[in-house]
Amino acid sequence: FERTRSLQDPCSNCPAGTFCDNNRNQICSPCPPNSFSSAGGQRTCDICRQCKGVFRTRKECSSTSNAECDCTPGFHCLGAGCSMCEQDCKQGQELTKKGCKDCCFGTFNDQKRGICRPWTNCSLDGKSVLVNGTKERDVVCGPSPADLSPGASSVTPPAPAREPGHSPQ
């Protein structure tokens, strides 16, 4: 019986962008300004998200879809659907509770967000440092000694590598 009733429910005919108005004999009424319904058969419309403060509007709210926000310059999105904005830092820095701080020696961050990560350790793969690391860039490892030996093939597969610190030679 319940199933039959739901099939005959007049609200199921209300399309996205409308709601089934109980106060008006269950007729389909358009969503009021600043609200939306993204699916049919809704008994209410949802309030549109408002992009205020550090949030800015990436996509306006319509009767069938919610507004989408991103962050003002100097901030970046965090969380699903950009639920938070976090302050950018410079490359070579990370955000702490006390603000942006330079990466410690031996670490780097090549982005405006995220944390400082340790330089690759070239010596773990038996390699030397080709280019030193900086606060903004990881170390670049050179080829392994085996790649440099007289019998090394002229076509070597991609040579992994890894080490912080000083220059080879």
Epitope: V140, P160, A161
Partner: nanobody
């Protein structure tokens, strides 16, 4: 993956010049450090010069003041300008592209300095 192809090698007289090119496939090449190595018969490959993604350069003592490494990121190419060449510069010259712990070799180009 980035692939590297060297060119510009050849036979040159002592005191002459050559310019080697290392051309790369792949638009991320600009983020790679690139080095030139060379290998004479029966000897290990030795580092000649390296240029970082930012353009910082470093040279082996044996080529300082004679060789210049440079890069043109718009052309995805790194160059090695070799002046005042000596017979001891004779070798196969290899390009090595590296980023963090990854590296790729080219196939090499022969440079012979002889009168």
């Amino acid at each position: 993956a980035v692939q590297l192809v060297e060119s510009g090698g050849g036979l040159v007289q002592p005191g002459g010049s050559l310019r080697l090119s290392c051309a790369a496939s792949g638009s991320i090449f600009s983020s790679y450090a690139v080095a030139w190595y060379r290998q004479a018969p029966g000897k290990p490959r030795e580092l000649v010069a390296v240029i970082s993604s930012e353009g910082t350069t470093r040279y082996a003592d044996s080529v300082k003041g004679r060789f210049t490494i440079s890069r043109d990121n718009a052309k995805n190419t790194v160059y090695l300008q070799m002046n005042s060449l000596k017979p001891e510069d004779t070798a196969v010259y290899y390009c090595f592209g590296g980023r963090s712990s990854m590296g790729t070799w080219g196939q090499g180009t022969q440079v012979t300095v002889s009168s």
